[in-house]
Every structure is written in structure tokens, then in C-alpha cells.
């Protein structure tokens, strides 16, 4: 969690002198309670916005917006504390709006915004706006909280942010997976424009289960520049286990910007559909011989193997 370094945040508006200050998340009014405290914020809204840093990087930010209630407690409102809590790490970051002049009622409702909290892809936050001074112990709460889930890098706008691009979001491998026969799987994908290696992770599962029955990892060496953006294909040899028919193929790139933390892409091949009723056993001899070498009783220790090609 951090604050955007540019431009400087502003909370002043017509009819109000105000400055934004860093906060320890422990306002003085917690320690020295006041008798008269303002009511809570109204209509707190959190939206995903995007902002550029001074260096030109694009980051997702939490755009926080709220209004004031139209009651007399506006006369006792001295500011607001904005808090963002990252749920999985308990990390909290706060800023304080410090009002330097008294608020007065006027023809329009007071409305405040803040868009300087930088957030991470695929993370959940709890955003709280506390009006200041905070209430006395056992007093009515004068804060409003909302949860905010930041989309992952698959999201169209997130894809072009600096944190997502650093993890390889612009690469679309357009994976196709084809079952050649019971023992071979062909994987095709588009290479990115970087001379870096890739890893293909094959995990096979029985029809209706989530415990894998076969795993195989295949390394693809870094392509040459003339192969960038070309299709690459790999043929993977499957372990011939009966019922081990659902295959998940995951491609892991190792781009220089994200090393082993790059976004992975996957594709799945389902088991062939089983007929609802078993086929009747014919009462005649088939007119062809079964193909030799297609026994289901292959050695279980047979390791998966593979070969690959880059297409020019």
C-alpha cells in the first residue's frame, strides 16, 4: 500500500480551506474524546480509477468519494480520516483531511473525493472514512466502510497498468490444445517478443476428480528474435492410464520483468463424452483387426516425453 507521489492531493474546494496530511491512523480524538462530534459520512463510493506517476507509469488507484449529511453536526466537523486496509496482510494506510475553516451549509451538498491510494491487482481492501473528531466511547459511530476488490490483470483496463504489464499481461499466447491420440497431446501457442524460456506444465486428471493422475513439465528454450510472435508447437506424450483423460496445460513464461512470477495461461482438454448407455456388444465379429500397440496395459512407469517446433 502506498500513496501516489504526483500530483499533490488536494482537498480544498470553494468555501472550504483544507489540507491533506499523512496520518498514523490514530487521530488525537481517540485519545482525547470531544463532547460534540459530527455525524457519519453519507453515500461512500469506491471506484477503480487509474493514474500516472511523474515517471509516466500507470497504476490502479482507489477513487474514494462521499458526501456530508445535512444536519447541524456539520458545524463540528474538523476533517476526515481516510483509511485503506489490505485484508490479507492487515496493512493499513491513512491520510487526514484537515479543515482549516468552518463548514457552512449552502445550496449544494458537500462532496469530497480522494484518488491517491495505489492498490494492487487481485487484492481486496476495506476503505473507511471517519469524520473527525471521532466519537466518544460508546457514542454513535461516525464512520462508513466499504470493501473494494481490485480486478486481476485479465481485466481490460488493468492489463495496461505498470504492475500488470510487468507481469506479462500483454502477452496473449492464444493456446490451442489438441488430442492427437490416446497418448499424445499437441500444444500450440504464440511466442512473445522476448528471448526468454517457457515452461509447459501438463497436469492430467480423471474424469470427475481433482487429484492429478499424471504430471509432466516440458522446457522450451528461448526463441531467436526471428521467431518472436511466431507459433510454437509441442507434442507431449501422455502416460497411458485408463481414465486419466482430462488434461490441463499451463504455459509459464520467464520474462525479464517478472522472472518466475509471470502471469500464466492455461487451457484444458476435457475427457471424451461417454455415451449414456453402454454400446451393445455386437453378436458378430468385427471386419477389422484392432491396431497393434494400442494396449491399455502399458507400463505405469513410462515417463511423459515431448518434442517441440517453432513455426516461422
Amino acid at each position: 500500500l502506498r500513496l501516489l507521489d504526483f500530483p499533490a492531493p488536494v482537498c480544498a474546494q470553494e468555501g472550504l480551506s483544507c489540507r491533506v496530511k499523512n496520518s498514523t491512523c490514530l487521530d488525537d480524538s481517540w485519545i482525547h474524546p470531544r463532547n460534540l462530534t459530527p455525524s457519519s459520512p453519507k453515500d461512500l463510493q469506491i471506484q477503480l480509477h487509474f493514474a500516472h506517476t511523474q515517471q509516466g507509469d500507470l497504476f490502479p488507484v482507489a477513487h474514494i468519494e462521499w458526501t456530508l449529511q445535512t444536519d447541524a453536526s456539520i458545524l463540528y466537523l474538523e476533517g476526515a480520516e481516510l483509511s485503506v486496509l489490505q485484508l490479507n496482510t492487515n496493512e493499513r494506510l491513512c491520510v487526514r483531511f484537515e479543515f482549516l475553516s468552518k463548514l457552512r451549509h449552502h445550496h449544494r451538498r458537500w462532496r469530497f473525493t480522494f484518488s491517491h491510494f495505489v492498490v494492487d491487482p487481485d487484492q481486496e481492501y476495506e476503505v473507511t472514512v471517519h469524520h473527525l473528531p471521532k466519537p466518544i466511547p460508546d457514542g454513535d459511530p461516525n464512520h462508513q466502510s466499504k470493501n473494494f476488490l481490485v480486478p486481476d490483470c485479465e481485466h481490460a483496463r488493468m492489463k495496461v497498468t505498470t504492475p500488470c504489464m510487468s507481469s506479462g499481461s500483454l502477452w496473449d499466447p492464444n493456446i490451442t490444445v489438441e488430442t492427437l491420440d490416446t497418448q499424445h497431446l499437441r500444444v500450440d501457442f504464440t511466442l512473445w517478443n522476448e528471448s526468454t524460456h517457457y515452461q509447459i506444465l501438463l497436469t492430467s486428471f480423471p474424469h470427475m476428480e481433482n487429484h492429478s493422475c499424471f504430471e509432466h513439465m516440458h522446457h522450451i528454450p528461448a526463441p531467436r528474435p526471428e521467431e518472436f510472435h511466431q507459433r510454437s508447437n509441442v507434442t507431449l506424450t501422455l502416460r497411458n492410464l485408463k481414465g486419466c483423460c482430462r488434461h490441463q496445460v499451463q504455459i509459464q513464461p520467464f520474462f525479464s520483468s517478472c522472472l518466475n512470477d509471470c502471469l500464466r495461461h492455461s487451457a484444458t482438454v476435457s475427457c471424451p463424452e461417454m455415451p449414456d448407455t453402454p454400446e451393445p456388444i455386437p453378436d458378430y465379429m468385427p471386419l477389422w483387426e484392432p491396431r497393434s500397440g494400442s494396449s491399455d496395459y502399458k507400463d505405469d512407469d513410462d515417463k511423459g516425453s515431448s518434442h517441440h517446433h517453432h513455426h516461422h
Epitope: N88, N90, Q123, E126, D261, R264
Partner: antibody, heavy 118, light 107 residues
Amino acid sequence: EVQLVESGGGLVQPGGSLRLSCAASGFTFSSYSMNWVRQAPGKGLEWVSFISARSSTIYYADSVKGRFTISRDNAKNSLYLQMNSLRDEDTAVYYCARPKVGGGMDVWGQGTTVTVSS
Amino acid sequence: DIQMTQSPSSLSASVGDRVTITCRASQGISNYLAWYQQKPGKFPELLIYAASTLQSGVPSRFSGSGSGTDFTLTISSLQPEDVATYYCQKYNRAPFTFGPGTKVDIK
């Protein structure tokens, strides 16, 4: 001293219910998310459930979803786990644990034992 | 859901040996990884968070490294009091899954 103390464990029949409690002291409980983690006899750690500081976000492991309910009472500095439709495989030591600022769980209770058996 | 695997499942080493335990996530989890030590009959204790940050009070012979999918816990010089089971845990998003554990004992 920062402390978590679990209670409420015991012997229960399959299909029965139990409510675990975790009493927190020595820190501002209302500012922290909390977790339940369990450990079956001779097995590894299994994360069970998470609740955020203001109860606005709750997560469960698939193995307990629909049967267990996590809750908290910040006024009483207490965390709870209501366990219904208990199964043999729910037999474990149940720990409540506080996440550290920055990640991981830095404060754990001593655990309470739940035995599901007929 | 992201799966966590650990290797080896158990190891025996001599006092003073350098011990390395690896943890692998089935998908990238950035540095949202913690390591715990659990001694027999005791509750787990946090050793390392954010993949490489040592928890206060933990001896400096423990260190963590890695990011993304591959993580390592290293004990630079194994001591008798380090006999325990070590677990990794991901906490980028729920479910906050633990690895299956690595049991460490002295030869």
C-alpha cells in the same frame, strides 16, 4: 502480553454441533482480521476460515463451507467458530490465529481439541 | 485454487549442516508467502513473512528467498532446537493454503 485462548472443544457425535470461542487480550482486537486453522492428529496445518476486522469479509475453506460459520464480537474481544454437521474428518486441534501486519500469522492460541466420533 | 507443495517431506541432517526446504505454488503468488516452525505438541510459530522478512525474535540462521512460484527456507547451521516440522503458507488471496510440511530431525 498478546494472547489468544481457545475454548469450547470436546467430544461430539457425527452430525452434531459445537461452538468454539477465542478470547483475545493484549492488543486492539477490533483492528485485526482473524483466522481459524486446524490440525488433524498426525497431519499438517489446514486453514479453515478468515474474518476481517469489521466482519465485512469472510472466507471459508471448501472443506467446511456451508457447515461452519465464523463470527466475532469486537466489544467482547472474542472470535467464534460455529461448527454444524460435524464429520469424522473434522477431528482436529483448532487454533485461532492473528495475521501479522505484512503477512503471515504471528499470534496463535494454544489450540482446543475437537473429537468427532460415535 | 492454488496448490502448495513442499520438498522434501522429511530430512535428517547433522548439527551445523546447512538445510534447505523448498515450497512451490502452482501459480504465481508474488511474495505473499510465510514460513512456520511447529515443534511436537506446540502451536506453529511464524519464522518468515513476505517470503524473505525475518520475524522479530527469530534467529538469523533462518532465511527465506523466492518470489512467484518458487520459495526456499534455509537454516544456515542446523541446531538441535530446530527439530520441528516446517510449513509454508500462501496469503495472496483466500484460501490461505498451507504446504504439507517438511519434518526436520537430527542425524
